[in-house]
């Protein structure tokens, strides 16, 4: 077995957790997760390899001069799921009620507030933790009377006797007489969606709260990943 | 609960070797980085070096290199720390602490007092 | 390295009273740490990243700073905090501890 470093046979590569470092034309050890390469190699002596300082990490093995700077914090609109470690950058996710705008490489660069549906309309399709609320207006015979992004158009109560018709923004209202109903009273909710892993957020313009397109804010490049450093 | 016990005081003669344990209970031992740190006569605090035991590898701070060894028994999950070539100056109270990857110590053991004295 | 200076080394303060120690760093650090020591007691991690409190740390206990400029407040001092305090960081290699202020009870 050749200790590092060594000369690879012609036409030969390095093994695993090994790389080729070409000024000294030798085989070398690269540095595990939370190291980093404070001394290179040379054709008598292995790299030299020192921890990640603070806010610092590699999360692959790797022969990197630096660590790469952890994210900055995470944003009012984010909770941080994962904290900065010498193995692993910090993970932000968009907080309930919000999903991820604009995707990066891992997790998220802008969350956006969901959509609410004002009265009128209905969620006719969930936020999801990638993609906003869809509202539509609900149809006759149904209604909602909120701003929401969870709540459905429901059904209006039927009355033996009409005393206010209902609309799409409001219930019927009927004579004293008791109603019947197709469905239980209150509002139906849809589940708020997971949110996924985010990072360097903006603010967010307002929430529309008719359907429609929601506008993104433009955003700098993401930072450069930790190139060819894998096993 | 999560602690680190660390072996008794120990007195030895200038010029010997002294190796002291630092055993770890109640964790994945590999999930958790290493460290000592040296305290001369209840003054301040020295960083030696950290042991990662998922990988084996080690750094020290360079004014203990040759002078502090660093290794790892996974399987009593005990990590160990030898210092050589004793001088006076090496008395001192020696603590074992983790780091759980971040950059402060969250679990201190209970200190070895080294004592070197002909 | 850096060197951490902790001032004032030793220090008193009646029950009550506010107290504030520093700690200057020779470069500038990311996060400063403190540790709270008694005698015959290992230290014991009490602020990280500069303002978070340790498990189990009162809430009187507050960290801040940035930069070079550091400092550990005690908002209204008692008895159990007469203890030694150590600054840390690790923003530079090796990481490195101040020589301590001493906080005595009058």
């Known amino acids: 077995v050749a200790f590092t470093p060594y000369a690879p046979e012609p036409g030969g590569t390095c093994r695993l957790r090994e790389y080729y470092d070409q000024t000294a034309q030798m085989c070398c050890s690269k540095c595990p997760p939370g190291q980093h390469a404070k001394v290179f190699c040379t054709k008598t002596s292995d790299t030299v390899c020192d921890s990640c300082e603070d806010s610092t990490y590699t999360q692959l093995w790797n022969w990197v001069p630096e660590c790469l700077s952890c994210g900055s914090r995470c944003s009012s609109d984010q909770v941080e799921t994962q904290a900065c470690t010498r193995e692993q950058n910090r993970i932000c996710t968009c907080r309930p009620g919000w999903y991820c705008a604009l995707s990066k490489q891992e997790g998220c660069r802008l969350c956006a507030q969901l959509r609410k549906c004002r009265p009128g309309f209905g969620v006719a399709r969930p936020g999801t933790e990638t993609s906003d609320v869809v509202c539509k207006p609900c149809a006759p015979g149904t209604f909602s009377n909120t701003t929401s992004s969870t709540d459905i158009c429901r059904p209006h109560q039927i009355c033996h006797v009409v005393a206010i018709p209902g609309n799409a923004s409001m219930d019927a209202v009927c004579t004293s007489t008791s109603p019947t109903r197709s469905m239980a009273p209150g509002a139906v909710h849809l589940p708020q969606p997971v949110s996924t892993r985010s990072q360097h957020t903006q603010p967010t313009p307002a929430p529309s709260t008719a359907p429609g397109t929601s506008f993104l804010l433009p955003v700098g490049p993401s930072p450069p990943a930790e190139g060819s450093t894998g096993d | 609960e999560f602690q680190l016990q660390q072996s008794g005081p120990e007195l030895v003669k200038p010029g010997a070797s002294v190796k002291i344990s630092c055993k770890a209970s109640?964790?994945?031992?590999?999930?958790?980085?290493m460290n000592w740190v040296k305290q001369s006569n209840g003054k301040s605090l020295e960083w030696i070096g950290i042991i990662f035991p998922k990988y084996g590898t080690t750094s020290y701070n360079q004014k203990f290199k040759g002078k502090a060894t660093l290794t790892v028994d996974q399987s009593s999950s005990t990590a160990y720390m030898q210092l050589n070539s004793l001088t006076s100056e090496d008395s001192a109270v020696y603590y074992c602490?983790?780091?759980?990857?971040?950059?402060?110590?969250?679990?201190w053991g209970t200190g070895t007092t080294v004592t070197v004295s002909s | 390295q850096i060197v951490l200076t902790q001032s004032p080394a030793l220090m008193s303060a009646s029950p009550g009273e506010k107290v504030t120690m520093t700690c200057s760093a020779s470069?500038?650090?990311?996060?400063m740490y403190w540790y709270q020591q008694k005698p015959r007691s290992s230290p014991k991690p009490w602020i990280y990243?500069?303002?978070n409190l340790a498990s189990g740390v009162p809430a009187r206990f507050s960290g801040s700073g940035s930069g070079t400029s550091y400092s550990l407040t005690i908002s209204s001092m008692e008895a159990e905090d007469a203890a030694t305090y150590y600054c840390q960081q690790w923003s530079s290699n090796p990481p490195t501890f101040g020589s301590g202020t001493k906080l005595e009870i009058k």
């Open positions: 109640s964790y994945s031992f590999t999930d958790y980085n």
């Open positions: 470069s500038s650090v990311t996060y």
């Open positions: 602490a983790t780091d759980g990857g971040t950059w402060y110590f969250d679990v």
């Open positions: 990243l500069t303002s």
